[in-house]
């Protein structure tokens, strides 16, 4: 029988799609040779016994985005060929024991975005071939021991967006083939030692957006194949020595949105594949010598929105491949002249929203490839002569929102700006702040010859009334990604949100860091 139910479309006899609010029960009869059946966006509320009895050749069954709240235990009887079953985006609160009995060939089971409050070992006991189990977006508060013990072939397990408050150290111990484990957006406050010891093939571990306050020193020591580790948006206040020592394959590590106060030398390493390190939105106050010295392949280092007031001269030793360095929105008042000397490949540096009063003349001496420098919203009154002269690739320089002192000492900077005006962009040019007689006038346009001679201007002069002067015009389901480049120029957008985390909810597409990198 090759007929197609009127509520469905059968593009080829073996592919059936039934969609629409008018559907309130599984359409029948379905083509006996159907291999793929999709029931989407219907008003089906329950599945009775054996609604799929006559389509035993079915390989893929998607029952998604319906009103489904009850399933009878024998609903999937006779579907022994099934490899893919999705019940995602429904209203399931309970799974009957034995619901999946007979589905011995199942490879992917998607139960995400339901209202499940518990799972039991009996639910998954016969799934020796299961490779992917999606349970994210439910109401799970606890996972009993043994639930996953029979899933020896599992490679991807998503438990994100639940209400898990603690984990037993034994629940993942049999998952030796697991490559991706996602536990993001739960309420985990600690991860017991040994929790991941059985997951020797783990490549990606997502723990972001929990309430983790402390990490056990050896927590990741058995996960030498780990490539991506997401720890952002937790309450981690310190990193125990050696925590990342056994992760030679790691290429992405996110620690932003925690409570880290300090980074001790040697904490990162050796991780020769690490390309990106995200540390913004912590409470870091200083950077010691050699803190990143093991990260020879690091290309992106984000330290913005901390409370950094001191950077040791050798803090950035070893970062020979670094391309982007974000230090904006910290409390820097000064920088050592040699602090960036090792960053020979640096292209973009963000120093805006600090309290920099001056810069050493050699601050960018070795950093010949710099393309963008953001210095806006600091306390700069002048810059040393020749500070930018060797930067042939410089194409974006932001100097506005600084209290430039336009006395005779400003002449070298004024002259350089005159010759390099295109590099400043067109929207916002630097203007004089003092002396009051030239306040508001463009640093580029002002006639420095008639500017007052160099005098000691009070740091905060009284402000009498002055006539106005002309105005001159930073996979889905993954909050660890960013939509803004590290050097994004953040005009009126709030600079406090430099690296906006985006939330993606579909678990089927790529998980990238930025649009450009998510291939």
């Amino acid at each position: 029988y090759y007929g197609c139910p009127s509520e469905c479309t059968c593009s080829r006899a073996s592919q059936v799609e039934c969609t629409g609010a008018r559907i309130v029960a599984v359409p029948a009869p379905l083509p006996w040779n159907a291999m793929s059946l999709q029931i989407l966006n219907t008003h089906i509320t329950e599945l009775n016994e054996s609604p799929f009895l006559n389509i035993s050749a079915l390989i893929a069954l998607r029952i998604e985005k319906n009103e489904l709240s009850h399933i009878m235990p024998g609903a999937f009887r006779n579907l022994g060929s099934l490899r893919y079953l999705s019940l995602a985006n429904n209203k399931l609160q309970v799974l009957p024991i034995g619901l999946f009995q007979g589905l011995n060939n199942l490879e992917s089971l998607l139960l995400s975005s339901n209202q499940l409050v518990q799972i039991q070992p009996a639910h998954f006991s016969q799934f020796s071939n299961l490779k992917e189990l999606q349970l994210h977006g439910n109401h799970l508060e606890y996972i009993p021991d043994g639930v996953f013990d029979h899933l020896v072939g599992l490679t991807k397990l998503n438990l994100g967006k639940n209400s898990l408050t603690h984990l037993s150290p034994r629940i993942f111990q049999r998952l030796g083939n697991l490559q991706v484990l996602r536990l993001y957006e739960n309420r985990l406050s600690e991860i017991p030692m040994g929790t991941f010891d059985g997951c020797g093939n783990l490549q990606e571990l997502a723990l972001q957006q929990n309430q983790i306050g402390m990490l056990s020193p050896g927590l990741f020591h058995n996960n030498r194949n780990l490539q991506k580790l997401y720890l952002s948006n937790n309450h981690i206040s310190q990193l125990p020595p050696g925590i990342f020592m056994q992760l030679p394959q790691l290429n992405r590590l996110t620690l932003f949105g925690n409570s880290l106060k300090e980074l001790s030398p040697g904490i990162f390493g050796p991780m020769h594949n690490l390309r990106e390190l995200w540390l913004y939105d912590n409470h870091i106050t200083s950077l010691p010598d050699n803190v990143f010295s093991n990260l020879h392949q690091l290309q992106v280092l984000i330290l913005s929105r901390n409370q950094i007031n001191y950077i040791s001269p050798d803090a950035f030793n070893g970062l020979v491949e670094l391309r982007e360095l974000s230090l904006h929105t910290n409390a820097l008042q000064e920088l050592d002249g040699s602090v960036f000397r090792m960053l020979v490949n640096l292209q973009n540096i963000s120093l805006q929203n600090n309290r920099l009063r001056q810069l050493p003349g050699n601050i960018f001496a070795n950093v010949n490839g710099l393309m963008t420098i953001q210095l806006q919203n600091n306390q700069l009154e002048n810059l040393p002569m020749g500070i930018f002269d060797h930067l042939g690739n410089l194409c974006e320089l932001r100097l506005y929102d600084n209290p430039w002192r336009c006395d005779s000492d400003i002449l070298p900077l004024h002259n350089w700006l005159l010759l390099n005006k295109p590099r400043l962009g067109t929207d916002t040019l630097p203007v004089c702040f003092s002396p009051p007689s030239v306040r508001g006038q463009s640093l580029i346009i002002i006639n420095v010859n008639v500017a007052v001679p160099s005098v000691q201007v009070p740091m905060i002069p009284e402000v009498p009334s002055y006539p106005e002067t002309p105005q001159y015009p930073d996979t889905p389901s993954f909050p660890d990604t960013t939509s803004v480049s590290t050097t994004e120029f953040t005009s009126p957008v709030e600079d406090y949100t430099d690296l906006t985390t985006i939330e993606v909810t579909d678990d089927r597409s790529t998980w990238g860091m930025t649009q450009a990198q998510s291939g």
Epitope: Y400, D401, V431, I460, V463, Y466, P492, V493, D495
Partner: antibody, heavy 121, light 107 residues
Framework: QVQLLESGGGLVQPGGSLRLSCAAS????????MSWVRQAPGKGLDWVSV????????FYTDSVKGRFTISRDNSENTLYLEMNSLRAEDTAVYFC??????????????WGQGTLVTVSS | IVLTQSPSSLSASVGDRVTITCRTS??????LGWYQQKPGKAPKLLIY???SLQSGVPSRFSGSGSGTDFTLTISSLQPEDFATYYC?????????FGQGTKVAIKR
């Protein structure tokens, strides 16, 4: 002399919106950061938001982030605070304040007289 | 960053030396200011950068401290000094005020 004049306050229901304005005169407006500070009846001072001279940098207190937007029109010498999704706890006198420098600092040498925002059903 | 002022209130007589302290929950270097506010009025800046006297403010006001402990001192209290005093840190966003110290006339 420096003058700051706030307006736009009033009674609004929870969930409602208001736009506060602060008209500035007597100084080169575009070369000073500006801020909003509020004070609930009988309570202490509470910093709300700051914006740099050009408007290129803005910052907010956590409780208003995503609901309030600070902006400025340097050609009109006016500071704004757009307030959405207002809550009862936003009830306060809102002061506009001029910083002592162009970059974002918390030292305000001139203040307006304040405008009262009442959020109540 | 939490700022804790002490005392919350005090009573003093004209001519007295008055000291108000402000303690911060984290090190803020010297990024602290002091404000005076009288009932029904806007605040007035007294001290910036922990110890610098704002232009036009009488020299009987002084500020000291760095790191986490800061002090505002009025060397000889005058009748016009009875008011509420607030400290403000601008080292780290969000900026935060202390809860205030009310200086009242001793009866």
């Amino acid at each position: 002399q420096v003058q700051l004049l706030e307006s736009g306050g009033g009674l609004v229901q929870p969930g409602g919106s208001l736009r506060l304005s602060c008209a500035a005169s007597g100084f080169t407006f575009s070369t000073f950061a500006m801020s909003w500070v509020r004070q609930a009846p009988g309570k202490g001072l509470d910093w709300v938001s700051v914006i740099s001279g050009t408007g290129g940098s803005t910052f907010y207190t956590d409780s208003v982030k995503g609901r309030f937007t600070i902006s400025r029109d340097n050609s009109e010498n006016t500071l704004y605070l757009e307030m959405n999704s207002l809550r009862a706890e936003d009830t306060a006198v809102y002061f506009c304040a001029k910083a002592v420098t162009v970059n974002t600092r918390g030292f305000f040498d001139y203040w307006g007289q304040g405008t009262l925002v009442t959020v109540s059903s | 960053i939490v700022l804790t002022q002490s005392p919350s209130s005090l009573s003093a007589s004209v001519g007295d030396r008055v000291t108000i302290t402000c303690r911060t929950s984290q090190v803020i270097r010297n990024d602290l200011g002091w404000y005076q506010q009288k009932p029904g009025k806007a605040p007035k800046l007294l001290i910036y950068d922990a110890s610098s006297l704002q232009s036009g403010v009488p020299s009987r006001f002084s500020g000291s401290g760095s790191g986490t402990d800061f002090t505002l001192t009025i060397s000889s209290l005058q009748p016009e000094d009875f008011a509420t005093y607030y400290c403000l840190q601008d080292n780290n966003y969000p900026w935060t005020f202390g809860q205030g110290t009310k200086v009242a006339i001793k009866r």
